[in-house]
């Protein structure tokens, strides 16, 4: 390690000649005042004055001898002012002071950059007593210095509530450059310029930067740290790093991969999670995102029936959660389904198409042209209807459900009849005379019961009345059902 020691300032004596018990032989008093302190010999405490803050790094002891002669001021001796060494080397430095024996319990504390160093530091204080003074040497050692050990170290000693402070010892730990900012991995648009930043510090300074792209140096001459590299654009993935050089050597940053954004790969594993008569719940596994987040997805649905017109239904959805319920489908139908997703660059190709089917549903319309008439001779009500259009049966008809409600004099009762799918007529027994019978019919598939037709009412007279003409549901688009007598 290089050690730079400042020349020691020659102290000047406050009194002519050495005082008794001096450890030195060069006629320089042990308790001496460095020029640097700026202390004036005239500023001395009288024995009766209370203590006041010291000036500089010197304290004037208040105690006087039997002859009332004041003691000279106390100060730390000059030492090395600046130590430069390499990282991981050991260092030891010290403060020394000579203190008259009249003072008891003198302790020296070490401070770094204004903070006291406590605990696990290798600080040793040694005392060398003599007749009148004790030489105190406080040593501080660091076995393997790190950058964090850089700083200004001082010793402090308290005597009679006065603080004596040493000159600072500057420790400068030098080593290889240390990165404070390294290039970051990025995903960039093809052929578009972007910036990378690299910053490293010493000591020693200066730190110079070289950029490397795919093992080739980008700048053949160094640039002072910090350095910003403008990459003029890429057509394919590249790896960048930066080299930081100082007088101690070279440090290389981590290599970062710069990827080129591209359209995503198509989704995979499109699967059917659930089917109903009119909806299919699908899920998919997204493909590779092309180094750019997915924005949304498109579900394409086409009828698999060879006789269909081949039109495609498109449903747009968010990219998450890779799940979509396709609605408004026909019951008992086959569909081909494909999924495509997009990022900022564009749409992926469509996934492999999958086949899916909707289940049987309850019919979506009621039977048509419902007519009702009274067959008085057999005491029955005859009902006729037309089956709903095949497209709207939403499955295979298994029959019909007939609701007939009988109302007279505040009494009402509803009865339900099930009828097989073959017929389009039914006969029900008259339940109550002198009453109104309201009839509604619904088609039934294995998927469930469809909607009931609009009600058709017929009045059932008391026995002996004449036959009535039939009642019927109006043709589609007409007004409410009417009772025809």
């Amino acid at each position: 390690a290089i050690t730079e020691a400042r020349e020691e300032a020659k102290p000047y004596p406050l009194f002519p000649g050495p005082f008794p018990g001096s450890l030195q032989t060069d006629h320089t008093p042990l308790l001496s005042l460095p020029h640097a302190s700026g202390y004036q010999p005239a500023l001395m405490f009288s024995p009766t004055q209370p203590g006041r803050p010291h000036t500089g790094n010197v304290a004037i002891p208040q105690v006087t001898s039997v002859e009332s002669k004041p003691l000279p001021p106390l100060a730390f001796k000059h030492t090395v002012g600046h130590i430069i060494l390499s990282e991981h080397k050991g260092v030891k430095f010290n403060c020394s002071i000579s203190v008259p024996n009249i003072y008891q319990d003198t302790t020296i504390s070490w401070w770094k950059d204004g903070k006291e160093l406590l605990g696990a530091h290798h600080a040793i204080t040694q005392f060398y007593p003599d007749d009148e003074v004790t030489a105190i040497i406080a040593s501080f050692s660091i076995t393997s210095v790190q950058r964090s050990d850089n700083g200004s170290y001082i010793c402090k000693m308290k005597i009679n509530n006065e603080e004596i402070v040493s000159d600072p010892i500057y420790i400068e730990v030098q080593g290889l450059p240390h990165f404070t900012k390294q290039p970051e991995s990025m995903n960039v648009t093809r052929n578009t310029a972007f910036n990378l930043t690299c910053q490293a510090v010493g000591p020693p300074e200066p730190v110079n930067i070289f950029w490397v792209q795919n093992s080739s140096r980008v700048n053949e001459q160094p640039e002072k740290s910090p350095s910003v590299l403008t990459v003029p654009g890429l057509t394919e993935m590249a790896v960048f790093s930066c080299e930081a050089h100082n007088d101690k050597g070279l440090t290389v940053s981590k290599g970062v991969q710069i990827n080129i954004k591209a359209i995503p790969s198509p989704p995979t594993e499109v699967s059917i999670r659930n089917s109903t008569a009119h909806s299919i719940l699908i899920s998919w596994v997204p493909g590779f995102d092309g180094y750019s987040p997915f924005r949304n997805c498109s579900i394409q649905v086409k009828e698999a029936d060879p006789l269909s017109n081949g039109s495609v239904m498109i449903f747009n959805t968010s990219a998450l959660p890779h799940l979509y319920q396709i609605k408004q489908l026909q019951a008992l139908a086959n569909y081909s389904i494909g999924v495509s997703c997009m990022n900022e660059i564009g749409w992926s190709a469509v996934s492999p198409w999958i086949l899916a089917s909707t289940t049987e549903g309850a019919p979506s319309v009621a039977p048509l042209n419902v007519t009702v008439f009274l067959n008085e001779s057999s005491d029955n009500v005859d009902i006729r209807w037309m089956k709903p259009p095949t497209k709207q049966q939403d499955g295979e008809l298994v029959g019909y459900r007939i609701s007939h409600v009988w109302q007279s004099a505040g009494i009402s009762k509803e009865l339900l009849e099930e009828v097989g799918q073959n017929g389009s007529r039914a006969r029900i027994s008259v339940q109550v005379h002198n009453a109104t019978c309201t009839v509604r019919i619904a088609a039934v598939t294995r998927g469930g019961v469809g909607p009931f037709s609009d009600p058709v009412k017929i009045f059932i007279p008391a026995h002996g009345w004449v036959d009535y003409a039939p009642s019927s549901t109006p043709a589609p688009g007409n007004a409410d059902p009417v009772l025809i007598i």
Epitope: N191, S216, Q221, P232, G233
Partner: antibody, heavy 118, light 106 residues
Framework: QIQLVQSGSELKKPGASVKVSCKAS????????MNWVRQAPGQGLKWMGW????????TYADDFKGRFVFSLDTSVSTAYLQISSLKAEDTAVYFC???????????WGQGTLVTVSS | EIVLTQSPDFQSVTPKEKVTITCRAS?????MHWYQQKPDQSPKPWIK???NLASGVPSRFSGSGSGTDFTLTINSLEAEDAATYYC?????????FGQGTKLEIK
């Protein structure tokens, strides 16, 4: 603005030496390396090598090792190309050009014609 | 070293015509630069790093390519474009230039 100004044309006899200068202005000379490029009459461009203006270290392309020397005088922001033991085939225009990122030659001197003839 | 082969060597073109000059590298390179040179002048930087037009270059010029195949395109040739165009690779030392393509106006 950035300029590279080269010395004038030279007529030399075979075996002689020549020193071409390239004076830079408008930028910090030591920030960019200096390339040398040769163009023989009616021919294309051929990279001869470059000199690091920060360290003074030259790099020569294989065809230009031996008789060719790149040097600098940073105090006057000038790069030099010296050719010794001149041959007839050294007759060419010699260009200096700045060395930017990605070996982009952003600025060129006007060229110096060196003619070697007995 | 990487050899750059330009084609064509020479082309005589009428104004307003579209011109394409190709530069093929013997191995993959990261970037291709292009320079324009007119008789008795020094080369001018023309297209930097494959596709970036140098300052003052008209927008009718464009550059593209990657790997080993690169092109300089002039969308609608003008008389002032008559010159020799050189490609130069970055990525592998030594730096090399193509042999040049001379464009002449008919």
């Amino acid at each position: 603005q950035i300029q590279l100004v080269q010395s004038g044309s030279e007529l030399k006899k075979p075996g002689a030496s020549v020193k071409v200068s390239c004076k830079a202005s408008g930028y910090t000379f030591t920030n960019y390396g200096m390339n040398w490029v040769r163009q023989a009459p009616g021919q294309g461009l051929k990279w001869m090598g470059w000199i690091n203006t920060y360290t003074g270290e030259p790099t020569y392309a294989d065809d230009f090792k031996g008789r060719f020397v790149f040097s600098l005088d940073t105090s006057v922001s000038t790069a030099y190309l010296q050719i010794s033991s001149l041959k007839a085939e050294d007759t060419a225009v010699y260009f200096c050009a700045t060395y930017g990122h990605y070996a982009w030659f952003a600025y060129w001197g006007q060229g110096t014609l060196v003619t070697v003839s007995s | 070293e990487i050899v750059l082969t330009q084609s064509p060597d020479f082309q005589s073109v009428t104004p307003k015509e579209k011109v394409t000059i190709t530069c093929r590298a013997s191995s993959s390179v990261s970037y291709m630069h292009w320079y324009q040179q007119k008789p008795d002048q020094s080369p001018k930087p023309w297209i930097k790093a494959t596709s970036n037009l140098a300052s003052g270059v008209p927008s009718r010029f464009s550059g593209s390519g990657s790997g080993t195949d690169f092109t300089l395109t002039i969308n609608s040739l003008e008389a002032e474009d008559a010159a020799t165009y050189y490609c130069q690779q970055w990525g592998t030392k030594p730096l090399t230039f193509g042999q040049g393509t001379k464009l002449e106006i008919k």
